[in-house]
């Protein structure tokens, strides 16, 4: 089930998924002056079987001015700089696929990709929050949000994070061990398909990963 809304907005913070649950869609958006190739995919889809998940479909952009010329998919370093990001630009370390069943990694950029990514998250997805540069994190609990299904409706839990305007940056995800919070943690309820295992996998993974590129717009 796709989540009906975006994850909550926290002032002076951005969020990031460390891995994407099967069923997640990423729209194939191109930057200004470019368009999807003719008959090109509209989105990438995280899918697979019990042992391996990957992104199906490939996003490809071509110049709006030219006809029938396909731009290569492999991004050049200068292309990647054009994506709208915060200062956090160290790349995410690849995760061994087998260690994260039912999830896909962050899709690599494609050439002439739009500056903002439009994701369609699914129930059970967890995103992690980090204060933007120049703001410091005050944790009351986990700085994360989970999309849950309750009574047939989807909702995101509220991340327990406040970003204060001090010229210090916090590590991501969480340089201090956050206190457990019932609201921040997904309880095991049959209606929302979120399990403790999902949480544990992603938490462990988040702790061992380097910071990923943060885009400012997820939908």
């Amino acid at each position: 089930e796709l989540c009906d809304d975006d994850p909550p907005e926290i002032p002076h913070a951005t969020f990031k998924a460390m891995a994407y649950k099967e069923g997640t869609m990423l729209n194939c958006e191109c930057k200004r002056g470019f368009r999807r190739i003719k008959s090109g995919s509209l989105y990438m889809l995280c899918t697979g079987n019990s042992s391996h998940s990957s992104w199906d479909n490939q996003c490809q952009c071509t110049s709006s001015a030219t006809r029938n010329t396909t731009k290569q998919v492999t991004p050049q370093p200068e292309e990647q700089k054009e994506r709208k990001t915060t200062e956090m630009q160290s790349p995410m370390q690849p995760v061994d696929q087998a260690s994260l069943p039912g999830h896909c990694r962050e899709p690599p950029p494609w050439e002439n990709e739009a500056t903002e990514r439009i994701y369609h998250f699914v129930v059970g997805q967890m995103v992690y929050y980090q204060c933007v540069q120049g703001y410091r994190a005050l944790h009351r609990g986990p700085a994360e949000s989970v999309c849950k299904m309750t009574h047939g409706k989807t909702r995101w839990t509220q991340p327990q994070l406040i970003c204060t305007g001090e010229m210090e940056t916090s590590q991501f995800p969480g340089e201090e061990k956050p206190q457990a919070s019932p609201e921040g943690r997904p309880e095991s309820e049959t209606s929302c398909l979120v399990t403790t295992t999902d949480f544990q996998i992603q938490t462990e993974m988040a702790a061992t990963m380097e910071t990923s590129i943060f885009t400012t717009e997820y939908q």
Epitope: D5, M25, L42, T47, I118, H120
Partner: antibody, heavy 117, light 104 residues
Framework: QVQLVQSGAEVKKPGASVKVSCKAS????????MHWVRQPPGQRLEWMGA????????SYSQKFEGRVTITADTSASTAYMELSSLRSEDTAVYYC??????????WGQGTTVTVSS | QIVSTQSPDTQSVTPKEKVTITCRAS?????MQWYQQKPDQSPKRWIY???KSASGVPSRFSGSGSGTDYTLTINSLEAEDAATYYC???????FGQGTKLEIK
């Protein structure tokens, strides 16, 4: 529950245009791609194009590009498909369909468009 | 433009018979989808990601294949399975021409 309700049957003359509507309910309209697929009598399903109502991004089949325009009114949760320069070969049932990612999970009931002089 | 070709076009079968419908894509794809359509009805999602059954689909239906060749199998046909089945490429949105199953 998710429902896609399409406008009624149309009879048009060659050269005219037709605009079919698809009213969505029971889900967040702006967050799913909406496709238009047609089916001439006794023939295969044929993809015409799609729209992402969240930002009005569209994609069209090369076969119909230039003749088809797909739009969406997010305030009314309604998608529209307009086909111009109609010819007899455009006689078909036209369907709107919601894209769930893995598959088109919900379809409208279909709108019959007959092109005849 | 990717083309999907199904065979056979029409198949006349008796109940309890095993039925196989094939779909060949003009270029290699990762996955194939299948839809079922009955007369005067909208199509219904049936099989996705080559082998996964959509909810409500009887267990006698299964899908398999890879690359360019894909198969929809009905283990023991029932009268309610009489319909036209279409294969569908998710990446290019092309449909096969359909295979009509008739009950003898």
């Amino acid at each position: 529950q998710v429902q896609l309700v399409q406008s009624g049957a149309e009879v048009k003359k060659p050269g005219a245009s037709v605009k079919v509507s698809c009213k969505a309910s029971g889900y967040s309209f702006t967050r799913y791609w909406m496709h238009w697929v047609r089916q001439p009598p006794g023939q295969r399903l044929e993809w015409m194009g799609a729209i992402y109502p969240g930002n009005s991004d569209t994609s069209y089949s090369q076969k119909f590009e230039g003749r088809v325009t797909i739009t969406a009114d997010t305030s009314a949760s309604t998608a529209y498909m307009e086909l111009s320069s109609l010819r007899s070969e455009d006689t078909a049932v036209y369907y709107c369909s919601r894209d769930y990612g893995y598959y088109f999970d919900f379809w409208g009931q279909g709108t019959t468009v007959t092109v005849s002089s | 433009q990717i083309v999907s070709t199904q065979s056979p076009d029409t198949q006349s079968v008796t109940p309890k018979e095993k039925v196989t419908i094939t779909c060949r894509a003009s270029s290699s794809r990762s996955y194939m989808q299948w839809y079922q359509q009955k007369p005067d009805q909208s199509p219904k999602r049936w099989i996705y990601d080559t082998s996964k059954s959509a909810s409500g689909v009887p267990s006698r239906f299964s899908g398999s294949g890879s690359g360019t060749d894909y198969t929809l199998t009905i283990n023991s046909l029932e009268a309610e399975d009489a319909a036209t089945y279409y294969c569908h490429q998710r990446s290019s949105y092309t449909f096969g021409q359909g295979t009509k199953l008739e009950i003898k």
